[in-house]
């Protein structure tokens, strides 16, 4: 049944979205939308009246602040607004995602899992170096200035690489070579300066002054999310707690439902642009 507007509401210049309401079309005002707006000395025919001049001042339009989510574009209609949604989204405000993991929405090697709540059809777990709801944004890890002593940082995608200034060495250029000249650390260890005496920073599984002694690889608690660590001849193995997976139990199998809606970049087809 058609809505019954406020009694006397102008059928030509007014409309309603709820019973008993009378909302005016552009250029008309008054409780029943029967008063034409004077535009002679006013900048805008829409909006609340100015207390000093009686003129109407610009008010918020239905598209102000863009009510359309997920990259939808807003256009004003005589009665309200309309959202044009990107591929994969629908709803009054493009708030519903039609994309699922089957569409391959996670880029750059992101792991896709089904969302835990109905509003979230999927969630992307991004690999190191990528972020965004679809893992579409590369993280600028070099902006954190991880290379010490003025070293140059290169983001290789799968890892970082530091190129060191003269007199420095090590994976992060953290070692002053003056102290370590002629010194060597065994088993992939790196030499660290320290008040005239050298010290070795040992690779996983080794310890001692020169990294010649076998160390417990589980001592550093490498297994995340409560995973149990087991040492064996070739290193360590993580036995993950229920709900987690990965070499270090770093990935949730069933992550908590996220309220933030994933945004599929417009025009992108499912696929994985390799780095």
């Amino acid at each position: 049944a058609p809505l019954v507007c406020r009694a006397g509401c102008s059928p030509e210049h007014g409309f309603c979205e709820q019973p008993g309401e009378c909302r005016c079309l552009e250029g008309w005002t008054g409780p029943l939308c029967t008063v034409p707006v004077s535009t002679s000395s006013c900048l805008s025919p829409r909006g609340p009246s100015s207390a000093t001049t009686g003129c109407l001042v610009p008010g918020p339009g239905p598209c102000d602040g863009n009510p359309c989510a997920n990259g939808g574009s807003c256009s004003e209609t005589p009665r309200s607004f309309e959202c044009t949604c990107p591929r994969g989204f629908y709803g009054l405000r493009c708030e519903v995602s039609g994309v699922t993991c089957a569409d391959g929405p996670c880029f750059n090697g992101g792991l896709c899992v089904g969302g835990a709540d109905p509003d979230s059809a999927y969630i992307c777990h991004c690999p190191p170096g990528f972020q965004g709801s679809n893992c579409e944004k590369r993280v600028d890890r070099c902006s954190l200035q991880p290379c010490r002593n003025g070293g140059l940082c290169l983001d290789l995608g799968h890892a970082l690489r530091c190129r060191c200034r003269a007199g420095f060495a090590g994976p992060r250029c953290e070692h002053d070579l003056d102290d370590c000249a002629g010194r060597a650390c065994a088993n992939g260890g790196t030499c660290v300066e320290g008040g005239g005496a050298h010290r070795c920073s040992c690779a996983l599984g080794f310890g001692g002054r020169d990294c010649r002694e076998r160390a417990d690889p589980c001592a550093a608690r490498p297994c995340a999310h409560g995973g149990r660590c087991y040492a064996h001849f070739s290193g360590l193995v993580c036995a993950c707690a229920p709900g987690y997976m990965g070499a270090r139990c770093e990935f949730p199998v069933h992550p908590d439902g996220a309220s933030a809606l994933p945004a599929a970049p417009p025009g992108l087809r499912p696929g994985d642009p390799q780095r």
Partner: antibody, heavy 128, light 112 residues
Framework: QEQLVESGGGLVQPGASLTLTCKAS????????MCWVRQAPGKGPEWIAC???????AYSASWAKGRFTVSKTSSTAVTLQVTGLTAADTATYFC??????????????????????WGPGTLVTVSS | DIVMTQTPASVEAAVGGTVTIKCQAS??????LAWYQQKPGQPPKLLMH???VLTSGVPSRFSGSGYGTEFTLTISDLECADAATYYC??????????????FGGGTEVVVK
């Protein structure tokens, strides 16, 4: 004792395919890249490809793309698949480890840029 | 991709003498240079990395220096066991996003 051992080499016909295997022992396979380097008789070493064990990222020389594929097949083994072999591919193929280093709170692992452990190599001869 | 050029291709010296090998990179690699020793029938063995940091077990008769594009490996108090071919190596990262490794052509050291 840290060790790499290659296998799968031998005499093959031109145009054939071959899969070489590298088995590691005595060290933690993670936080390392396992790489393949070849050396033709009387020539210098030539890098082919690597695979970073932590996330499976593979990277290869521009000339090797398409014909050479590196894969991690288990927690202690990697393979190199070669297709369309020619006489120019005759060489000793080495498996080599390039270490990566991790730091607590650091944003990523850090590549070392060198090879600190090599296997003895496996000879591949391409001839009809 | 980067090009590593080694000189000389071959050098001869007497026991107890000194040998100097040069390596030139086609672009600035800071200190990202490694040196390897290879004997016939064996794989290359890492001698030093970061231009001058000796690997464990390598005698201090071996020393490295250089920065940027010019690097040097010096072997002093030469021994018969030092007879081998020596290679320099660096890694590269191109603007196209490709990462890789490049070796020099090698220098054969003959000990008299």
């Amino acid at each position: 004792q840290e060790q790499l051992v290659e296998s799968g080499g031998g005499l093959v016909q031109p145009g054939a395919s071959l899969t070489l295997t590298c088995k590691a022992s005595g060290f933690d396979f993670t936080s390392n890249a396992m790489c393949w380097v070849r050396q033709a008789p009387g020539k210098g070493p030539e890098w082919i490809a690597c695979i970073y064990n932590d996330d499976g990222s593979a990277y290869s020389a521009s000339w090797a793309k398409g014909r050479f594929t590196v894969s991690k097949t288990s927690s202690t083994a990697v393979t190199l698949q070669v297709t369309g072999l020619t006489a120019a591919d005759t060489a000793t193929y080495f498996c080599a480890r390039s270490p990566y280093y991790t730091y607590g709170g650091a944003p990523s692992a850090y590549a070392s840029g060198y090879f600190n452990l090599w296997g003895p190599g496996t000879l591949v001869t391409v001839s009809s | 991709d980067i090009v590593m050029t080694q000189t000389p291709a071959s050098v001869e010296a007497a026991v107890g003498g000194t040998v100097t090998i040069k390596c030139q990179a086609s672009e600035n690699i800071y200190n990202s240079l490694a040196w390897y020793q290879q004997k016939p029938g064996q794989p290359p063995k890492l001698l030093m990395h970061d231009a001058s940091v000796l690997t464990s077990g390598v005698p201090s008769r071996f020393s490295g220096s250089g920065y940027g594009t010019e690097f040097t490996l010096t072997i002093s108090d030469l021994e018969c066991a030092d007879a081998a071919t020596y290679y320099c190596q660096s890694d590269y990262y191109s603007t196209g996003g490709s990462y890789g490794f490049a070796f020099g052509g090698g220098t054969e050291v003959v000990v008299k």
